[in-house]
């Protein structure tokens, strides 16, 4: 059975989820990346994507979601601002990288948002103030940004081994210091 690891974030309404998903720098720096939610019994829902090709350190905002791809560090930074209770759920970072074989990583983000004022932010970077100002360089982006005809595809974790498939996604690992909750299926 495939072992999936969940990394749990417990935050309050109004706070900001701040996730850093790492990837293999040489392979995927310019690949389009996406942020998805996986609701119980449903297919993954793509919520936001970087541009294609992904631009370095160029914030893309879709609603309350901000994606920034740091090519130099091999990091996709995902922020969800002004969190609401209904944002609670299981999320994952993915890379659109056809037609190469997937490099499988299995960490997903379990977000739990509870009611209550977030208070004064402390040293935890996830505890951000209620009001969040989007940087002026942020662009509004359709997701995904495809050229025509559309050919970009992905694939979720299938096994711990590398699996050769013509069209695939790469699930990225979140590398912030948080609780790991192993989940087995």
């Amino acid at each position: 059975a495939t072992k999936l690891t969940e990394e749990k974030y417990e935050l309050k309404e109004g706070q900001t989820l701040d996730v850093k998903c790492d990837y293999t720098l040489e392979k995927f720096a310019s690949s389009q990346k996406a942020w998805q939610i996986i609701r119980d019994g449903e297919m993954p829902k793509t919520l936001a994507c970087t541009e294609r090709p992904s631009k370095n350190s160029h914030p893309v905002q879709v609603g309350r979601i901000i994606l920034e791809d740091y090519h130099d560090h091999g990091l996709l930074r995902v922020r969800m601002v002004n969190l609401q209770v209904e944002d609670s759920g299981l999320y994952q970072c993915v890379i659109y990288q056809p037609p190469k074989e997937p490099h499988m990583l299995f960490d997903r983000i379990r977000l739990v948002v509870t009611k209550g004022f977030s208070g004064t932010p402390g040293s935890n970077e996830n505890s951000t103030q209620n009001v969040y100002k989007i940087p002026p360089t942020t662009t509004k982006a359709l997701c995904p940004l495809y050229t025509s005809p559309r050919t970009v595809t992905q694939a979720p974790p299938k096994s711990t081994a590398d699996v050769s498939t013509p069209d695939s996604e790469i699930n990225l690992t979140n590398v912030t210091d948080i609780i790991r909750v192993p989940v087995f299926n």
Partner: antibody, heavy 119, light 113 residues
Framework: QLQLQESGPGLVKPSETLSLTCTVS??????????WGWIRQPPGKGLEWIGS???????YYNPSLKSRVTISVDTSKNQFSLKLSSVTAADTAVYYC???????????WGQGTTVTVSS | DIVMTQSPDSLAVSLGERATINCKSS????????????LAWYQQKPGQPPKLLIY???TRESGVPDRFSGSGSGTDFTLTISSLEPEDVAVYYC?????????FGGGTKVEIK
């Protein structure tokens, strides 16, 4: 260019099992950006989603048909299939296979195949 | 299940005139975090499969003429054909893909007056 093509018998007897196959060409079924599904349209009526499957075999069914539906995938043949058991005349419809992707909905469709349930 | 209700059932419009189709969902299909509505519009011509026109309620699919536009949010949506062309004669369906089971509206038949 990705194409989907449905195949299977056009006539099925009541109480039997309807079996259809969708062959994917011009692209790989082995990708979970896409889910592969079945939709049907009774004569002169609207569209009804039957269910969808991922390349890894995760299935999602319409509760109204769940007890009678099985969708399966064969990645080696780049195909996915529909089985609908205990059919009645109400299952007479054009059956479409389609590709689903969450930002888009169902963006590529097969031409459809007509299935008539009759003795 | 989310029930999708379309109106009118049929619509006769003169060539070059505007056609407006409405779609109402029984619950919101707006996803809060990205402010996107998971609603699509399809065009189906006789003897053909449906063709995706609009996704995310207002984004035109690649290759779709700009006379087609989608608007609305939450539970109320509109497909507008700004200037009807002969090839636009078809049945149009809205569909929610926010939650399972995916559901379609009953369709609106657009004809030339």
């Amino acid at each position: 260019q990705l194409q989907l093509q449905e195949s299977g018998p056009g006539l099925v007897k009541p109480s039997e099992t309807l079996s259809l196959t969708c062959t994917v060409s011009g692209g790989s079924i082995s990708s979970s950006s896409y889910y592969w599904g079945w939709i049907r349209q009774p004569p002169g009526k609207g569209l009804e989603w039957i269910g969808s499957i991922s390349y890894s075999g995760s299935t999602y069914y319409n509760p109204s048909l769940k007890s009678r539906v099985t969708i399966s995938v064969d990645t080696s043949k780049n195909q996915f299939s529909l089985k609908l058991s205990s059919v009645t005349a109400a299952d007479t419809a054009v059956y479409y296979c389609a590709r689903y992707y969450s930002p888009y909905g169902m963006d590529v469709w097969g031409q459809g195949t007509t299935v008539t349930v009759s003795s | 299940d989310i029930v999708m209700t379309q109106s009118p059932d049929s619509l006769a419009v003169s060539l070059g005139e505007r056609a407006t189709i409405n779609c109402k969902s029984s619950q919101s299909v707006l996803f809060s975090s990205n402010n996107k509505n998971y609603l699509a519009w399809y065009q189906q011509k006789p003897g053909q499969p449906p063709k995706l026109l609009i996704y995310w309620a207002s984004t035109r699919e690649s290759g779709v003429p700009d006379r087609f536009s989608g608007s609305g949010s939450g539970t109320d949506f509109t497909l507008t054909i700004s200037s009807l062309e002969p090839e636009d004669v078809a049945v149009y369906y809205c569909q929610q893909y926010d939650s399972l089971p995916f559901t379609f509206g009953g369709g609106t038949k657009v004809e030339i007056k």
